[in-house]
């Protein structure tokens, strides 16, 4: 049975060439968290952090995704093209399969607030 | 059922390079990564790296940095594991192993290799 | 890196014996342990994964038990083909790393 619920940053706002984490967080669950996979919004794999294997970032991302904090992403040198979903894949035993998904917009103004809240999606 | 089959044993001198192949066959590597451990005579298992297929990214034991590559070729489902500047030392069996990815990733290294052994002598 | 600490490093049993084999973590590891047997000559062959959890294939007279930093691999009554090394590895943080093993010998 899952028990366990994720909470994300939910909807974010980053300005262009910045920086932004993404960042989820599983709780009330003993579950081991075996892999967090990271995707974009058309699906494609960002990154992945595996319990054995460490941190492995997909090669064409490699110079603007940076592994962490913990568990979370950061994503730098922000251009318009990376608003949209992202979505936080925990693969735990026993439970299995946990998602959670963040918006996030890249704003032209060099004024734009980044800001974070977690919230239950 | 996927199994994996190593390269031969290899006898090479101190100082130079080994290469040793392990190829899956009855699988394919889309949602496996394989790590690669050695074991010196009458020695315990030490796990050298291990690299993700589908990303073509490897880690690596500290012990091993710059000293060992790791690389897969997806198209052939073979793993490769390169160890340079040998020493008499680097004298062991060394094992590719799979592992599952995604949600299968509670798993251990539940398949692996038969063994390649590696001798370092002049 | 954490260090995995196995005892005792070899034992003397009979068949139809209870074995008790433990593995000590120097940090806690939840319970990301998994347990292998070897026999001479032999790859590793994976028993119990997420400390407690049999390999398909694996039988019943294994077990596996323990949470944070200990843990014990139970054979309930050992058998002839059982004699062999076995090495507990954590898998909770990088890089992984394995105990230094455990001979089981007949007596």
């Known amino acids: 049975m899952m028990t366990g619920t994720i909470e994300t940053t939910g909807n974010i706002s980053a300005k262009k060439g910045g920086s932004v984490i993404l960042q989820c967080h599983l709780s009330s669950t003993m579950a081991q968290v075996t892999q967090v996979n990271w995707e974009q919004h058309d699906h494609s794999l960002l990154a992945i952090r595996n319990a054995e294997l460490g941190w492995h970032i997909y090669p064409a991302f490699k110079d603007r995704v940076a592994p962490g904090p913990g568990l979370g992403l950061t994503l730098q040198s922000l251009t318009m093209n990376d608003t949209g979903e992202y979505f936080c894949t925990y693969h735990t035993y026993p439970d299995g399969t946990y998602r959670g998904r963040i918006f996030l917009e890249v704003l032209e103004s060099s004024v734009a607030e980044h800001s974070a809240r977690f919230q239950i999606p | 059922q996927v199994q994996l089959v190593q390269s031969g044993a290899e006898v090479k001198k101190p100082g130079s390079s080994v290469k040793v192949s392990c190829k899956a066959s009855?699988?394919?590597?889309?949602?496996?990564?394989i790590s690669w451990v050695r074991q010196a005579p009458g020695q315990g298992l030490e796990w050298m790296g291990g690299?993700?297929?589908?990303?073509?990214?490897?880690n690596y034991a500290q012990k091993f940095q710059g000293r060992v590559t790791i690389t897969a070729d997806e198209s052939t489902s073979t793993a490769y594991m390169e160890l340079s500047s040998l020493r008499s030392e680097d004298t062991a069996v060394y094992y590719c192993a799979r592992l599952h990815l995604g949600s299968s990733a509670y798993y251990g290294m539940d398949v692996w290799g038969q063994g390649t052994t590696v001798t370092v002598s002049s | 890196d954490i260090q995995m600490t196995q005892s005792p490093s070899s034992l003397s049993a009979s068949v139809g014996d209870r074995v008790t084999i433990t593995c000590r973590a120097s940090?806690?590891?939840?319970?990301?342990l998994n347990w292998y047997q070897q026999k001479p000559g032999k790859a590793p062959k994976l028993l119990i994964y997420a400390a407690s959890s049999l390999q398909s294939g694996v039988p019943s007279r294994f077990s596996g038990s323990g949470s944070g930093t200990d843990f014990t691999l139970t054979i309930s009554s050992l058998q002839p083909e059982d004699f062999a090394t076995y090495y507990c590895q954590q898998r909770y943080v990088f890089p992984p790393t394995f105990g230094g093993g455990t001979k089981v010998e007949i007596k």
């Open positions: 940090q806690s590891i939840s319970s990301y």
């Open positions: 690299i993700i297929p589908i990303f073509g990214t490897a």
């Open positions: 009855g699988g394919t590597f889309s949602s496996y990564a």
